[in-house]
């Protein structure tokens, strides 16, 4: 379950989020059972690639989405699949490669003029706690620079970081994803030891800003592995 993922994951070492206690009182969280491997390495070796199990798109790379590998397959068995290119069939925006979105079941370019009108809406896994992020996860960049729609401000719903205004990234917020501030020097960050180790964080912090990296705070070097506090520090 998601709870067991959180218990085996770096997020358990975070201080309580600004928006609530560490245990998130008042909420119960569940996830599809048996398909999260938070310690797993998504890319084992080039010649020994193994499908990466997932529950939601956030667990996959920038150019991937989470789905059952077989058409109409068992929803309980899902893996990261390559994103769909332009003019390919889709069911939701996250299935389309960056720079595209899902309209009427087809991946179309985000930089076309139809962005002006009320286009078929968009994804949202969106709720709000700033203390939650993948170090680097949301760097899913680049929609075309010709975009016509307004960039999201902090607190607005997003699909990728390119949907958010400068200085913000798109990070999971409970059931959704919203624009949150990129972390500044000295702010607590989340360090994931290996790609794909984050599992399904119910909220995320953004990554550290330019010129900063997420490192163990100096005075925490002596602490046990499980309680080391990471902060954004100058390279």
């Amino acid at each position: 379950t998601l709870n067991s993922v959180l218990n085996s994951n770096a997020i358990k070492n975070l201080p309580p989020p600004l928006g609530g206690a560490a245990g998130h009182p008042g909420s119960a969280v569940s996830a599809a059972p048996g398909i999260l491997y938070p310690g797993g390495n998504k890319y084992q070796t080039i010649d020994n690639y193994q499908p990466y199990p997932c529950a939601e798109d956030e667990e996959c790379g920038t150019d991937e989405y989470c789905a059952s590998p077989t058409r109409g397959g068992d929803a309980g068995v899902q893996i990261c699949l390559a994103c769909r290119k332009r003019r390919k069939r889709c069911m939701r925006h996250a299935m389309c490669c960056p720079g595209n979105y899902c309209k009427n079941g087809i991946c179309v370019s985000s930089d076309q003029n139809h962005f002006r009108g009320e286009i078929e809406e968009t994804i949202t896994e969106s709720f709000g706690n700033d203390h939650s992020t993948l170090d680097g996860y949301s760097r899913r960049t680049t929609l075309s620079s010709k975009m016509y729609h307004t960039k999201g401000q902090e607190g607005s719903v997003c699909l990728r970081s390119s949907d958010c205004a400068s200085g913000l990234c798109c990070a999971r917020h409970f059931w959704s994803k919203i624009c949150k501030p990129v972390l500044k020097e000295g702010q607590v960050c989340t360090k994931h030891r290996r790609k794909g180790s984050h599992g399904l964080e119910i909220f995320q912090r953004c990554y550290c800003g330019e010129g900063l990296s997420c490192r163990i705070q100096k005075d925490h070097h002596q602490a046990s592995n499980s309680s080391r506090l990471h902060t954004c520090q100058r390279h």
Epitope: G19, F115, E118, E121, I123, S126, G155, V157, D163, W175
Partner: antibody, heavy 124, light 107 residues
Framework: QVQLVESGGGLVQPGGSLRLSCAAS????????LHWVRQAPGKGLEWVSS????????YYADSVKGRFTISRDNSKNTLYLQMNSLRAEDTAVYYC?????????????????WGQGTLVTVSS | DIQMTQSPSSLSASVGDRVTITCRAS??????LNWYQQKPGKAPKLLIG???SLQSGVPSRFSGSGSGTDFTLTISSLQPEDFATYYC?????????FGQGTKVEIK
């Protein structure tokens, strides 16, 4: 345009069960986080439950935890709330709500669109 | 849980009046706050997202401000159709919580 239509409300005895449905149209259902919010007669709004767009993460208010189950069928464009062990204090209008989109103008926010609600009355 | 305290709980005003409703969070919620308008027998309608973003189709006489713990919804010149109940919602922490509502009545 976006439409959310709740159904399944009615009169039920304490301890009984009901299943609410929210039929969605006018948007790509599987792209959105969805919610149930209720309002007791003459009272304020109370969040009940939320579900992520793919359905793998669910959230509940303490007052309904263990009794209510939120689910969604993306192939049917429908959100559900299964309510068991109903109590008098569950009497309320139940609204289904949907998040906004990053493509809204301006970009959207959570709990952006609401259905008209369905009344659930728990009484003996 | 994060408590949201709205004030006043009700107010009487005349058409053309400037009306201010406040919402205070029991802890900092950044700008993760929405404002809704609800008329009797109707569903809530989102007016303002993320504390200050006016939603499409909402008249410009509505505005929102604030960050952290104190937030304000202002109606610059009250119109007959504005008589309703207004709610704030925080979505910074779980569970999301609403204010108790402010009923705006005709004086």
């Amino acid at each position: 345009q976006v439409q959310l239509v709740e159904s399944g409300g009615g009169l039920v005895q304490p301890g009984g069960s009901l299943r609410l449905s929210c039929a969605a149209s006018g948007f790509t259902f599987s792209n959105y986080g969805l919610h149930w919010v209720r309002q007791a007669p003459g009272k304020g709004l109370e969040w009940v439950s939320s579900i992520s767009y793919y359905g793998s993460s669910t959230y509940y208010a303490d007052s309904v935890k263990g009794r209510f189950t939120i689910s969604r069928d993306n192939s049917k464009n429908t959100l559900y709330l299964q309510m068991n062990s109903l109590r008098a204090e569950d009497t309320a209008v139940y609204y289904c709500a949907r998040d906004g989109s990053h493509m809204d103008k301006p970009p959207g926010y959570v709990f952006a669109f609401w259905g008209q609600g369905t009344l659930v009355t728990v009484s003996s | 849980d994060i408590q949201m305290t709205q004030s006043p709980s009700s107010l009487s005003a005349s058409v053309g009046d400037r009306v201010t409703i406040t919402c205070r969070a029991s802890q900092g919620i950044k700008n993760y706050l929405n404002w809704y308008q609800q008329k009797p027998g109707k569903a809530p309608k989102l007016l303002i997202g993320a504390a200050s973003s006016l939603q499409s189709g909402v008249p410009s006489r509505f505005s929102g401000s604030g960050s952290g713990t104190d937030f304000t919804l202002t109606i610059s010149s009250l119109q007959p159709e504005d008589f309703a109940t207004y709610y704030c919602l925080q979505y910074y922490g779980m569970p999301p919580t609403f204010g108790q509502g402010t009923k705006v009545e005709i004086k």
